[in-house]
């Protein structure tokens, strides 16, 4: 899978993670901290 | 599936006020950005503002600073664009147009006619 | 902000004509590059995003290409249906429009 750091307006898009561009799959994607979860890293689970 | 469903065309008087609403269904807003883009008769496209319901933070293009407020209802899964002091050059079409995890997804845009 | 001038404001060209549109940032925007096509009275839409990659159902006539400030949108087999104005749009940093090619038949 071809990934690459996403566009620079999407910072602050993940709450607790770091975005991540897909390309093969055309998608923007939270990589989340432990702990962290939800489509932004937006939700603590522990 | 997803939808992003505007409020219907207004015509409006100059020095007026317009609020258009976009509500969204089949996914969260919070997990997106807002854009709105406007697009005056024969004339390009032209990126207004965007808001990002979750964190409720906006940029707006500096030519619309100050005329423009964008803002998100999270319960209501909506949002809205208010453009205030409005003058002939303001009659478009004006589009929202949601971004975030999947590339943009447009409305079906609203028609905002300024006329004395 | 970052600005788009995109070229020619209008072009003319036969049917089976390979046609070029061009994109140019005023700063590196790393490939965030898309491409829209509008008819008249229609929403536009979307044909190319992250310069190359093309939209399901859109025919593979449609091409992009290029990096750093640099981009261009590909038609390699004009079709009457092709005839519609096409903007490029950078979101790298926020979002700008070039301001549109209208493409016309011969």
């Known amino acids: 899978v071809s990934i690459t750091k996403c566009n620079s307006d999407m910072n602050g898009y993940c709450l607790h993670g770091q975005c991540i561009y897909l390309v093969d799959m055309s998608q923007n994607y939270c990589r989340c901290e432990v702990g962290y979860t939800g489509v932004r890293c937006e939700h603590f689970y522990l | 599936q997803d939808q992003l469903v505007q409020s219907g065309a207004e015509v409006k008087k100059p020095g007026a006020s317009v609020k258009v609403s976009c509500k969204a269904s089949g996914f969260n807003i919070k997990d997106t950005y807002i854009q709105w883009v406007r697009q005056a008769p024969g004339q390009g496209l032209e990126w207004m503002g965007r808001i990002d319901p979750l964190r409720r933070q906006t940029k707006y293009r500096e030519k619309f600073e100050g005329r423009v407020t964008i803002t998100a209802d999270t319960s209501t899964n909506t949002a809205y664009m208010e453009l205030s002091s409005l003058r002939s050059e303001d009659t478009a079409v004006y589009y929202c147009?949601?971004?975030?995890?999947?590339?943009?997804?447009w409305g079906q845009g609203t028609l905002v006619t300024v006329s004395s | 902000d970052i600005q788009m001038t995109q070229s020619p404001s209008s072009l003319s060209a036969s049917v089976g004509d390979r046609v070029t549109i061009t994109c140019r940032a005023s700063q590196d925007i790393h490939k965030y590059i898309a491409w829209y096509q509008q008819k008249p009275g229609q929403a536009p839409r979307l044909l190319i995003q992250?310069?190359?990659t093309l939209q399901p159902g859109v025919p593979s006539r449609f091409s992009g290409s290029g990096s750093g400030t640099d981009y261009t949108f590909t038609i390699s087999s004009l079709q009457p249906e092709d005839i519609a104005t096409y903007y490029c749009l950078q979101y790298e940093q926020l979002r700008t429009f070039g301001g549109g090619t209208k493409v016309e038949i011969k």
């Open positions: 147009v949601r971004s975030g995890r999947e590339f943009d997804y």
């Open positions: 992250y310069t190359s």
